[in-house]
């Protein structure tokens, strides 16, 4: 979802090893070593160059910056702070750059930053103030509209001794800086749960992608405040059933489209309300593809074709009658 440049001439800069000793900021048409630049497209690409830090001499005209496929490791505070500021930078793609730490204030001094893609980086340490830049209880609003955080979960052995979900949510909520966020992608992060307060504090969301996680339940998640939500991707999770409260909230969102494919739906008596709702609702895309995973006798049955007689629960035996 990051912009790509239109076909236009890219100038590239030969690598140089001398230290940057200057009396003035970079010339407007200067292109950093190991990068390709197009002033016409306002685009700089420093892609697959094994860079270990953000180039210091980025041209002031840059609107779209691609720093993908590098070895940045750490994004320090003020990583993009320049004099003059990179006032035009609107889209920043850092995906696949081996980032494992993003520090507080990493994106400060980027007043026009609308899209940020940190996908495919093993973020073991994402500062709570990575996006807000301040530890104030209410920070200056971030200009971010799209935040792409797909597959940022680090390997198990590199995780801190804290909940990964909690770390990500803390960064999303700090200082209430992301009130203007419209697109949030959190796919493929092994999320087991969604902290209950996260969505309530992102009221501008239009698109939320939580696909390919390990979400088992949405019982404690409220979608009620997300009145602008247009798409909710929940494919490829571990959802067993959606309960009445969730169904009612989703139905109450005026523009919503929900994607629920490839979840292990449990087709027992608890599924009755959801089946009834599915038959009536227009909000679920591809609802005819939803099938049961459990119990065994129901496997691959299409949810829309079930009726209440199909959805039974085995009686719970009193303890005296249970066999070991």
């Amino acid at each position: 979802s990051s912009p790509t440049s239109s076909a236009s001439s890219f100038s590239s800069s030969a690598p140089f090893l001398a230290s940057a000793v200057s009396a003035q900021p970079p010339l407007p048409d200067q292109c950093p070593a190991l990068c390709e630049c197009s002033e016409a497209a306002r685009t700089v690409k420093c892609v697959n160059r094994n860079l270990t830090e953000v180039p210091t001499d980025l041209p002031a005209y840059v609107r779209n910056l691609f720093l993908t496929g590098n070895q940045l490791a750490v994004l320090p505070a003020g990583a993009f702070a320049r004099r003059p500021p990179l006032a035009e930078l609107a889209a920043l793609n850092l995906s696949g750059s081996r980032l494992d730490e993003v520090r507080a204030g990493a994106f400060e001094h980027l007043p026009s930053l609308r899209q940020l893609d940190l996908s495919h980086n093993p973020l073991a340490d994402l500062s709570p103030f990575a996006f807000s830049g301040s530890n104030a209880s209410v920070s200056a609003p971030s200009p971010l509209v799209e935040l792409i955080l797909n597959h940022i979960v680090p390997p198990e052995d590199e995780r801190q001794n804290r909940s990964f979900e909690g770390m990500v949510v803390a960064a999303l909520l700090a200082g209430r800086a992301l009130q203007g966020l419209r697109r949030l992608e959190l796919a493929s992060n092994h999320f087991l749960y969604l902290p209950r307060d996260v969505l309530a504090q992102l009221p501008s969301l239009r698109h939320l992608d939580l696909s390919n996680n390990s979400l088992v339940s949405l019982t404690y998640v409220s979608f009620r405040n997300l009145t602008h939500l247009e798409s909710l991707h929940l494919e490829d999770n571990a959802l067993k059933v959606l309960h009445n409260g969730t169904l009612a909230e989703l139905q109450g969102l005026p523009h919503i489209r929900v994607f629920l494919d490839n979840n292990p739906w449990v087709c027992d008596c608890h599924m009755a309300d959801m089946v009834t709702w599915l038959k009536e609702t227009e909000v679920v895309q591809g609802k005819d593809r939803l099938t049961c995973a459990y119990p065994e006798k129901m496997r691959n049955r299409v949810l829309l074709e079930l009726n209440s007689a199909d959805l039974d629960c085995d009686p719970i035996l009193p303890p005296s009658l249970q066999t070991s």
Epitope: S19, A20, V21, S22, A23, Q24, P25, T56, P76, A77, G78, A79, A81, R82, R83, P84, P85, A87, G105, H109, P111, S112, A140, P143
Partner: antibody
Framework: EVQLLESGGGLVQPGGSLRLSCAAS????????MTWVRQAPGKCLEWVSE????????NYTPSLKDRFTISRDNAKNTLYLQMNSLRAEDTAVYYC??????????????WGQGTTVTVSS | DIVLTQSPASLAVSLGQRATISCRPS??????????IHWYQQKPGQPPKLLIK???NLESGVPARFSGSGSGTDFTLTISPVEAEDTATYYC?????????FGCGTKLEIK
């Protein structure tokens, strides 16, 4: 507590050289950009030069870059300013300064007390 | 280079009254989110002390009687009410571009 202590000032003849030092303590010197600012008697403050933590990025005020050289020794927690071909107009109090953040300076929270350089015959 | 013009060059204000100091950069030093102007206080024989960063953000430990405002090419430092200890010279500084530059100061005297 952050402390910056300048030394090396003194009286020097026109055309002579001096090397100023700024000894830093109370913080991780190797993380911070460092800056020299000077103030001629009764005059404005003038930004002189700055150096980034690993000495790879150095900036000077244009009129001084041919005569002044900034450097640092992170092992010794010390910032330097080598001043050559000194002129009467270089007479000033020289301050070293540090921002509160560890990226390129926008403002300066911490200042030394200054060392006085007098260029006179 | 960006030239910062401070006015007045000197100012005498009665104790408890309001002091207003102007700083005008020769070009805009503001983005949509930040203005790159900072204010310092300097007393005789001492180094400058940061009062306000980014035009309006009070540095920690600085009394709330100091405030800053403005954007683009017009900035103001206000001290209200003025106290005796505020006798000093006040400088603005821009960090929009290299070289960083300072204004030539406003000397405040308390009557």
């Amino acid at each position: 507590e952050v402390q910056l202590l300048e030394s090396g000032g003194g009286l020097v003849q026109p055309g002579g050289s001096l090397r100023l030092s700024c000894a830093a303590s109370g913080f991780d010197f190797s993380r911070y950009w460092m800056t020299w600012v000077r103030q001629a008697p009764g005059k404005c403050l003038e930004w002189v030069s700055e150096i980034n933590p690993d000495s790879r990025t150095i900036n000077y005020t244009p009129s001084l870059k041919d005569r002044f050289t900034i450097s640092r020794d992170n092992a010794k927690n010390t910032l330097y300013l080598q001043m050559n071909s000194l002129r009467a107009e270089d007479t000033a109090v020289y301050y070293c300064a540090r921002p509160d953040h560890d990226y390129n300076p926008y403002y300066f929270n911490y200042w030394g007390q200054g060392t006085t350089v007098t260029v006179s015959s | 280079d960006i030239v910062l013009t401070q006015s007045p060059a000197s100012l005498a204000v009665s104790l408890g009254q309001r002091a207003t100091i102007s700083c005008r950069p020769s070009q805009s030093v503001s983005t949509s989110s930040n203005s790159y102007i900072h204010w310092y206080q300097q007393k005789p024989g001492q180094p400058p002390k940061l009062l306000i960063k980014y035009a309006s953000n009070l540095e920690s430990g600085v009394p709330a009687r100091f405030s800053g405002s403005g954007s683009g090419t017009d900035f103001t430092l206000t001290i209200s009410p003025v106290e005796a200890e505020d006798t000093a010279t006040y400088y603005c500084q821009q960090s929009w571009e290299i070289p960083l530059t300072f204004g030539c100061g406003t000397k405040l005297e308390i009557k």
